[in-house]
C-alpha cells in the first residue's frame, strides 16, 4: 500500500494506490483511490508513466481529457467516471501489454488540495491450472495444464498423503511457447500416483501462483483451482 | 454405494437401432470415466467404448466404430449406447461400466441388459 | 491391439486346493492389468488391478502376481461361491481394452 500526500500541509491530501499485476492481452486495473470532493467539475485527475513523456490518461472537468496522452496509451484507458466522485480515480487499461510494465503515479488535484502515489506495475501471464488423470499413460499419471504463463515459472507437485516429498524425480514438465510468441503452456506430468490421495500441482512466477488439486477417490474425482497475484502491495 | 442400471434392450432387427442407457447413483458420475461392454451368449467379454469424464473424448473397438455412438448427460448421471445398423454379431448382454478412478479397469459393473438382433 | 491369451480354458478343483489361473498379453503391459470374476447370470465383479492389489471387499484367499507379459491368479483355498469363470483385462494400451477369453474354474 502506499499512502501519498501533497506537498504543503493544508493543501495536502491522501492519495492510495495498491501495486498489482496485468495479465497481458487481457485488462488490467491500476488502483489508486483518494479522498473524495463534493464537486466532480473540481477533480483532476492524472496518471504518469516513469520514462514516458505523455500522459496515461486525464480526467478533468467531469470528462476524459486525452489531447496529451501519449501514443502507446491511445484508445486503452479509461477511468471509472461514476466513481470519481467517491475517490475512486482507478485506471482500466485494455490489452494489457509486456511493455505496460513500469511505475505509474496516481496525481489528483480536488478543491481540498493536492496528492500522488506511486504504483508499482507488473505484467506478464498467469491462468489457472487444471489437474486430471492421464488414463492415456501407461503408469497411474495425473497431468496439469495452465494454457498462458510469462515469465517461465516453476511447477512444484505435493501430495496430501507424502506431505514434504520431492516429486521431482517422479514428474516432467514442458513450456510450450503459444502462438502470439510470449506467453507458454504449462504442461506438468506426475507419474506413480496412487489411489485415496489428494494431489496439487503449483505453478509460480514472479507475479502470480497457482495451484490446482485433484483428489482420487474410486467414488469421486474432486477438481479445485485458485490463483494468487503476488506483491499486491498498497501504498 | 456405486450402483449401476441399465436399461432400452430388447429384440430388434438387423440394420435398426436401438439406444442403451445406464442409471448411475452412489458416486460423482462427473468425474469417471464411463465403459460399455458386451458379453455375447456363452462367449467372452468384449470392452465396446469409453467415453471421458467430460464427455469430449469418446473410443471405440474397430467392431461397433461409424455404428455404435457412446454420450453422457452429466446432469442426469446417465450413460448412453446409441446403436446404429445393428447386426446379429452384436446380439449381447451390455454392461455399463465406471472406470476405475486412476486407470481403466473396470470397478463397478451394471447388472447388464439383453440386446437380441434376429428377423 | 494387445491379445491377452488365458489358460487353461477349463480347470477342475476340489473344494478347498489351491487354484492357480494363467494369463498371458501379446506384449508388455507392466503391471496393468485386471482380473475378474463372474458367476452364472450375473455380471463381472472386479478381484484384482494393478496386477496384485485386491479390489474393496476380496477377500485374502485371491492374490494375484507377474509384471510384463506373464500373470497368475491364485485361490488359495477354493470355497463353494469361488466356482466362476475367471477374466484378465490389460489397461496399458488402448484402444481397444483387451480380456482373455477366460478360465472356467469347476469342481471336480
Known amino acids: 500500500l502506499i499512502i501519498g500526500f501533497g506537498i504543503s500541509g493544508r493543501h495536502s491530501i491522501t492519495v492510495t494506490t495498491v501495486a498489482s499485476a496485468g495479465n497481458i492481452g487481457e485488462d488490467g486495473i491500476l488502483s489508486c483511490t483518494f479522498e473524495p470532493d463534493i464537486k466532480l467539475s473540481d477533480i483532476v485527475i492524472q496518471w504518469l508513466k516513469e520514462g514516458v513523456l505523455g500522459l496515461v490518461h486525464e480526467f478533468k472537468e467531469g470528462k476524459d481529457e486525452l489531447s496529451e496522452q501519449d501514443e502507446m496509451f491511445r484508445g486503452r484507458t479509461a477511468v471509472f467516471a461514476d466513481q470519481v466522485i467517491v475517490g475512486n480515480a482507478s485506471l482500466r487499461l485494455k490489452n494489457v501489454q509486456l511493455t505496460d510494465a513500469g511505475t505509474y503515479k496516481c496525481y489528483i488535484i480536488t478543491s481540498k488540495g493536492k496528492g500522488n502515489a506511486n504504483l508499482e506495475y507488473k505484467t506478464g501471464a498467469f491462468s489457472m491450472p487444471e489437474v486430471n488423470v492421464d488414463y492415456n499413460a501407461s503408469s497411474e499419471t495425473l497431468r496439469c495444464e495452465a494454457p498462458r504463463w510469462f515469465p517461465q515459472p516453476t511447477v512444484v507437485w505435493a501430495s496430501q498423503v507424502d506431505q514434504g516429498a520431492n516429486f521431482s524425480e517422479v514428474s516432467n514438465t514442458s513450456f510450450e511457447l503459444n502462438s502470439e510468441n510470449v506467453t507458454m503452456k504449462v504442461v506438468s506430468v506426475l507419474y506413480n500416483v496412487t489411489i485415496n490421495n489428494t494431489y496439487s500441482c503449483m505453478i509460480e512466477n514472479d507475479i502470480a501462483k497457482a495451484t490446482g488439486d485433484i483428489k482420487v477417490t474410486e467414488s469421486e474425482i474432486k477438481r479445485r483451482s485458485h490463483l494468487q497475484l503476488l506483491n499486491s502491495k498498497a501504498s | 454405494q456405486v450402483q449401476l442400471v441399465e436399461s432400452g434392450g430388447g429384440v430388434v432387427q438387423p440394420g435398426r437401432s436401438l439406444r442403451l442407457s445406464c442409471a448411475a447413483s452412489?458416486?460423482?458420475?462427473?468425474?469417471?470415466?464411463m465403459h460399455w461392454v458386451r458379453q455375447a451368449p456363452g462367449k467372452g467379454l468384449e470392452w465396446v467404448a469409453v467415453?471421458?469424464?467430460?464427455?469430449?473424448?469418446?473410443y471405440y473397438a474397430d467392431s461397433v466404430k461409424g455404428r455404435f455412438i457412446i454420450s453422457r448427460d452429466n446432469s442426469k448421471d446417465t450413460l448412453y449406447l446409441q446403436m446404429n445398423s445393428l447386426r446379429a454379431g452384436d446380439t449381447a448382454v451390455y454392461y455399463c461400466?465406471?472406470?476405475?478412478?486412476?486407470?481403466?479397469?473396470?470397478?463397478?459393473w451394471g447388472q447388464g441388459t439383453l440386446v437380441t438382433v434376429s428377423s | 491391439e494387445i491379445v491377452m491369451t488365458q489358460s487353461p480354458a477349463t480347470l477342475s478343483v476340489s473344494p478347498g486346493e489351491r487354484a492357480t489361473l494363467s494369463c498371458r498379453a501379446s506384449q508388455s503391459i507392466s503391471s496393468n492389468l485386471g482380473w475378474y470374476q463372474q458367476k452364472p447370470g450375473q455380471a463381472p465383479r472386479l478381484l484384482i488391478y494393478g496386477a496384485s492389489t485386491r479390489a474393496t471387499g476380496i477377500p485374502a484367499r485371491f492374490s494375484g502376481s507377474g509384471s510384463g507379459t506373464e500373470f497368475t491368479l491364485t485361490i488359495s483355498s477354493l470355497q463353494s461361491e469361488d466356482f466362476a469363470v475367471y477374466y484378465c483385462q490389460q489397461y496399458q494400451s488402448w484402444p481397444p481394452l483387451t480380456f482373455g477369453g477366460g478360465t472356467k474354474v469347476e469342481i471336480k
Open positions: 461400466a465406471k472406470g476405475g478412478g486412476l486407470r481403466w479397469y473396470f470397478a463397478y
Open positions: 467415453i471421458s469424464y467430460e464427455g469430449s473424448n469418446e
Open positions: 452412489g458416486f460423482t458420475f462427473r468425474s469417471f470415466g
